[in-house]
């Protein structure tokens, strides 16, 4: 959603669902910055590329970047 | 279940100040847009205004821009229209409707609306 | 802004008969379309959105279809409550959000 005048932040609802890591396509997580005083986590899924916003505070999203990261690390050499 | 309880509206005068509510419950309200749409009388459906789930983000339609302010209490389940310099052509019912927490915006449930009259 | 059309404004029908609702943007919405049926006195309720995906307890008699430009709700066989306004909705990524301005669907 786009960006007010002002504040250039992004998400206007945020998601508590669990996300599938089979699922998605790309995993973006914002920075708070001058711009946008909150931490942002943007999921694009396979299906659609439809996109969604995460909340950063909810437990299964936690869990999820957890296991992002652990599938990250067994990629890098 | 969802619910969305519409109120503070009335009869006023042009030029004239009102401010609406809208109590929700049933839900993680503190993760969830929240969106005023108006029909005015025997017309279609106008979206006025949105603020995001903290009430960083906020957008407004331009016919209602500089005069009318979105809040919420997140606190207390709370969203609030501040309508300043109110005009004749504002005569609607004003419907506090939830994000569909979607990218892409959606209202998946509304309030029972609530009428506000601006004449002289 | 995107402007949506609604047609026809009025449509005439009677229970059992099926209704098809035509919406049409003025530029492309990709399939991001909603549709609202509201009856007197009420607030619109969400049926479908993303074009074609029904809304939590909505009848399988409501079906919407189109991408692009061009979008269509129907309702395979009319019910007495389906007797109501329908709106059309582009949920763009950027505001405002805009409706149609309506079809009426009345008992013939």
């Known amino acids: 959603v786009p960006l007010s005048r002002t504040v250039r932040c992004t998400c206007i609802s945020i998601s508590n669902q669990p996300v599938n890591p089979r699922s998605l396509e790309k995993l973006e997580i914002i920075p708070a910055s001058q711009f946008c005083p909150r931490v942002e986590i943007i999921a694009t899924m396979k299906k659609k590329g439809e996109k969604r916003c995460l909340n950063p505070e909810s437990k299964a999203i936690k869990n999820l970047l957890k296991a992002v990261s652990k599938e990250m690390s067994k990629r890098s050499p | 279940q969802v619910q969305l309880v519409d109120s503070g509206g009335g009869v006023v005068q042009p030029g004239r100040s009102l401010r609406l509510s809208c109590a929700a419950s049933?839900?993680?309200?503190?993760?969830?847009?929240m969106h005023w749409v108006r029909q005015a009388p025997g017309k279609g459906l106008e979206w006025v205004a949105v603020?995001?789930?903290?009430?960083?983000?906020?957008h407004y339609a331009d016919s209602v821009k500089g005069r009318f302010t979105i809040t919420r209490d997140n606190s207390k389940n709370m969203v609030h229209l501040q309508m300043n310099s109110l005009r004749a052509e504002d005569t609607a019912v004003y419907y506090c409707?939830?994000?569909?927490?979607?990218?892409?915006?959606?209202?998946?449930?509304w309030g029972q609306g609530t009428l506000v009259t601006v004449s002289s | 802004e995107i402007v949506l059309t609604q047609s026809p404004a009025t449509l005439s029908l009677s229970p059992g008969e099926r209704a098809t609702l035509s919406c049409r943007a003025s530029?492309?919405?990709?399939?991001?379309v909603a549709w609202y049926q509201q009856k007197p006195g009420q607030a619109p309720r969400l049926l479908i959105y993303?074009?074609?995906n029904r809304a939590t307890g909505i009848p399988a008699r409501f079906s919407g279809s189109g991408s692009g430009t061009d979008f269509t709700l129907t309702i395979s066989s009319l019910e007495p409550e389906d007797f109501a306004i329908y709106y059309c909705?582009?949920?763009?990524?950027?505001?405002?959000?805009?409706f149609g301005q309506g079809t009426k669907v009345e008992i013939k």
């Open positions: 409707a939830r994000d569909s927490s979607s990218w892409y915006v959606y209202f998946d449930y």
């Open positions: 049933g839900f993680t309200f503190n993760t969830y847009g």
């Open positions: 603020i995001s789930y903290d009430g960083i983000i906020k």
């Open positions: 530029q492309s919405v990709s399939s991001y």
């Open positions: 993303d074009a074609s």
């Open positions: 909705q582009q949920r763009s990524n950027s505001p405002p959000w805009t």
